[in-house]
């Protein structure tokens, strides 16, 4: 197993709806054909594995188990979205690639993405 | 409506190992279930332990867990099971096996989980 840098923001702050966006950049060392991204959380005690997808270089990721990650790759460069996000989803949400194919195996775990999510107020009931 | 029945459980000395299994009786595809372990010691409340998600195998662990049980589960015999290595004495507690019919999420901890009876696992020092 052969060590990868990994980058990806600091923090981003999720919309209104419960989605939010970011960049997973790995430093490929070959011409990797096969990739497997996992998004994990750490967060209130626990490391969950959110969702997780495995590409062929220049096609669309494809997410299992009704996921809430959606993705498209370009290059080196995975962007992820996350949706139906609550509050109590906030955390830090490392991103994770694995070049599978062709040998020799790369890993790369990044820093981790701290993602606020604030519940929208209800609408106060209005007159008009 | 889901009945789960657990087994396994039993008395190990510290260090040692046990194999949890839940067997689930459900309704619909046993792999459309989330599936997990909680635990309760006496006096203490119930906590998470573990979880699977119900096709690709994502999992979610406790921190004071990771590294030492490990949850899996086989879809054709509608069953989940949680090897435990390397336990210890703060290990001994209720083993409960939950079932909840909901997709994966970030937050696999809060469910609205169907409860087995559980099995009791004691760890001596």
């Known amino acids: 197993c052969k060590a990868m840098h990994v980058a990806q923001p600091a923090v981003v702050l999720a919309s209104s709806r419960g989605i939010a966006s970011f960049v997973c950049e790995y430093a490929s060392p070959g011409k990797a054909t096969e990739v497997r991204v996992t998004v994990l959380r750490q967060a209130d005690s626990q490391v969950t594995e959110v969702c997780a997808a495995t590409y062929m270089m220049g096609n669309e990721l494809t997410f299992l188990d009704d996921s809430i990650c959606t993705g498209t790759s370009s290059g080196n460069q995975v962007n992820l979205t996350i949706q139906g996000l609550r509050a109590m989803d906030t955390g830090l949400y490392i991103c994770k690639v694995e070049l599978m194919y062709p040998p020799p195996y790369y890993l790369g775990i990044g820093n981790g993405t701290q993602i606020y999510v604030i519940d929208p107020e209800p609408c106060p009931d209005s007159d008009f | 409506e889901v009945q789960l029945v657990e087994s396994g459980g039993g008395l190990v000395q510290a260090g040692g190992s046990l194999r949890l299994s839940c067997v689930a009786s459900?309704?619909?595809?046993?792999?459309?279930?989330?599936m997990a372990w909680f635990r309760q010691a006496p006096g203490k409340e119930r906590e998470f332990a573990a979880a699977?998600?119900?096709?690709?195998?994502?999992?979610s662990y406790a921190d004071s867990v990771k590294g030492r049980f490990t949850i899996s589960r086989d879809n054709a015999k509608n069953t989940v099971y949680l090897q435990m290595n390397s336990l210890k004495p703060e290990d001994a507690a209720r083993y409960y096996c939950?079932?909840?019919?909901?997709?994966?999420?970030?937050?696999?901890?809060?469910?609205?989980?169907?409860w087995g009876q559980g099995t009791q696992v004691t760890v001596s020092s």
């Open positions: 939950a079932a909840d019919r909901r997709a994966w999420s970030a937050r696999p901890d809060m469910g609205n989980y169907y």
């Open positions: 459900a309704e619909g595809s046993f792999s459309t279930y989330v």
């Open positions: 699977i998600s119900g096709r690709s195998g994502l999992t």
